[in-house]
């Protein structure tokens, strides 16, 4: 079953390469188990950036080596992606799946264009 | 008389606060005197950033204290805005006027969204 997912159109990564955005899913009821996946689309290629399954009311737990962290509140997921470089500029799509209880619901956002600018290197200290 | 003006939708300022974009106007004939104005729109307020009048084939000359520089080639104007800070993020609109010979033509672009990220300060050297 299809589900509406909203996310901002544009986000700027900080000069430290950190970008945060909210992914909000409009469910007709309260799910107990939700899976959130961040996909990156660039040059018509789609790759998975990170994913987490969480029980509503609990924290999102990404893998230890993941570049993503997140928190949830109601149907809103606050996602943070770190370690971004200019070459990571692209469209980051939020995919939400209501895993339990059945039936399964799937929602895919329109994507957030994340712009990343590499910082100028600091001058060497003499 | 109306005239079509094209400019990119989005540009990222460098970490040094420099943003460049091309403003191209579709003139029905060959003008000899052209005026280019850059306007900034933010929070429904429009302010003039800089302006230059030039003779086709010659360099654009902005005022000495202007944050803009530029070059022209045919109907294309290469504009560079410097000294940008995060607070300067906004929609930068290119306005082109064909001043001479008559008739007078006016064209206004859809604007270029310039995103600016302030760099992290470098650590103090001991």
């Amino acid at each position: 079953k299809a589900m509406h997912v909203a996310q901002p159109a544009v986000v700027l990564a900080s000069s430290r390469g950190i970008a945060s955005f909210v992914c909000e899913y409009a469910s007709p009821g309260k799910a107990t188990e939700v899976r959130v996946t961040v996909l990156r689309q660039a040059d018509s290629q789609v790759t998975e950036v990170c994913a987490a399954t969480y029980m509503t009311g609990n924290e999102l737990t990404f893998l230890d080596d993941s570049i993503c962290t997140g928190t949830s509140s109601g149907n809103q997921v606050n996602l943070t992606i770190q370690g971004l470089r200019a070459m990571d500029t692209g469209l980051y799509i939020c995919k939400v799946e209501l895993m339990y209880p059945p039936p399964y619901y799937l929602g895919i956002g329109n994507g957030t264009q994340i712009y990343v600018i590499d910082p100028e290197p600091c001058p060497d200290s003499d | 008389k109306a005239m079509h003006v094209a400019q990119p939708a989005v540009v990222l300022a460098s970490s040094r606060g420099i943003a460049s974009f091309v403003c191209e106007y579709a003139s029905p004939g060959k003008a000899t005197e052209v005026r280019v104005t850059v306007l900034r729109q933010a929070d429904s307020q429009v302010t003039e950033v800089c302006a230059a009048t030039y003779m086709t084939g010659n360099e654009l000359t902005f005022l000495d204290d202007s944050i803009c520089t530029g070059t022209s080639s045919g109907n294309q104007v290469n504009l560079t805005i410097q000294g940008l800070r995060a607070m300067d993020t906004g929609l930068y609109i290119c306005k082109v006027e064909l001043m001479y010979p008559p008739p007078y033509y006016l064209g206004i672009g859809n604007g270029t969204q310039i995103y600016v990220i302030d760099p992290e300060p470098c650590p103090d050297s001991d």
């Epitope: 469910s27 007709p28 309260k30 109601g74 149907n75 | -």
Partner: antibody, heavy 119, light 106 residues
């Protein structure tokens, strides 16, 4: 399309039990969703009574917890309401409806059945 | 229990006009708000869920908005078939309904 249909006696005497059936077509009640009973009192107020989930677990309105039971017959694709020790205050139109999740919006409803509690 | 205060309890409007109904909740419900249309002899019909999402097949004349404890529901370009009673429902904790708004056409 999913359809729900309530049935049961229109008149119940005080202190007796009220029993209603909701027959579901177009979707298996064991496949998903929660299957609810809601009632509307003569003044138009709607009250959620409780549900039985796809897995057979229940959730009831705390105000009714001691008197209510919702069960099901999976072979007939039906679920049932039993309300004990009824009084005239239980006179209402009773609806069955479906919702997603623990709590949720009811996307399909029956047309309702009127129950009067009177001696 | 979360209490929903729906207002007005009744209203009269002209064909082609616009009406707005409000629903105030006794605590923040995280946008878990639904709106129903109810006509005599039928079951309620789900119009909107999660504050503003139109149920498939519902005309865009119907809309919802809100957050926290304050929610509203509007019908634009009123049509004769809109005569009904409208209810709000929260589904953040248990399922509870507002008192209803009876809409009539002038």
């Amino acid at each position: 399309d999913v359809q729900l249909q309530e049935s049961g006696p229109g008149l119940v005497t005080p202190s007796q039990s009220l029993s209603l059936t909701c027959s579901v077509t177009g979707y298996s009640i064991t496949s998903g969703y929660s299957w609810n009973w809601i009632r509307q009192f003569p003044g138009n107020k709607l009250e959620w009574m409780g549900y039985i989930r796809f897995d057979g677990n229940n959730n009831y309105n705390p105000f009714l917890k001691n008197r209510i039971s919702i069960t099901r017959d999976t072979s007939e694709n039906q679920f049932f309401l039993k309300l004990n020790s009824v009084t005239t205050e239980d006179t209402a139109t009773y609806y069955c409806a479906r919702n997603y999740g623990t709590w949720g919006a009811m996307d399909f409803w029956g047309q309702g059945t009127s129950v009067t509690v009177s001696s | 229990d979360i209490v929903l205060t729906q207002s007005p309890s009744s209203l009269s409007a002209s064909l082609g006009g616009k009406v707005t109904i409000t629903c105030k909740t006794s605590q923040d419900i995280n946008k878990y708000m639904a709106w129903y249309q109810h006509k005599p002899g039928k079951g309620p019909r789900l119009l909107i869920y999660y504050t503003s999402i139109l149920q498939p097949g519902i005309p865009s004349r119907f809309s919802g908005s809100g957050s926290g404890t304050d929610y509203s529901f509007s019908i634009n370009n009123l049509e004769p078939e809109d005569i009904a009673t409208y209810y709000c429902q929260q589904y953040d904790n248990l399922n509870t309904f507002g008192g209803g708004t009876m809409l009539e056409i002038k």
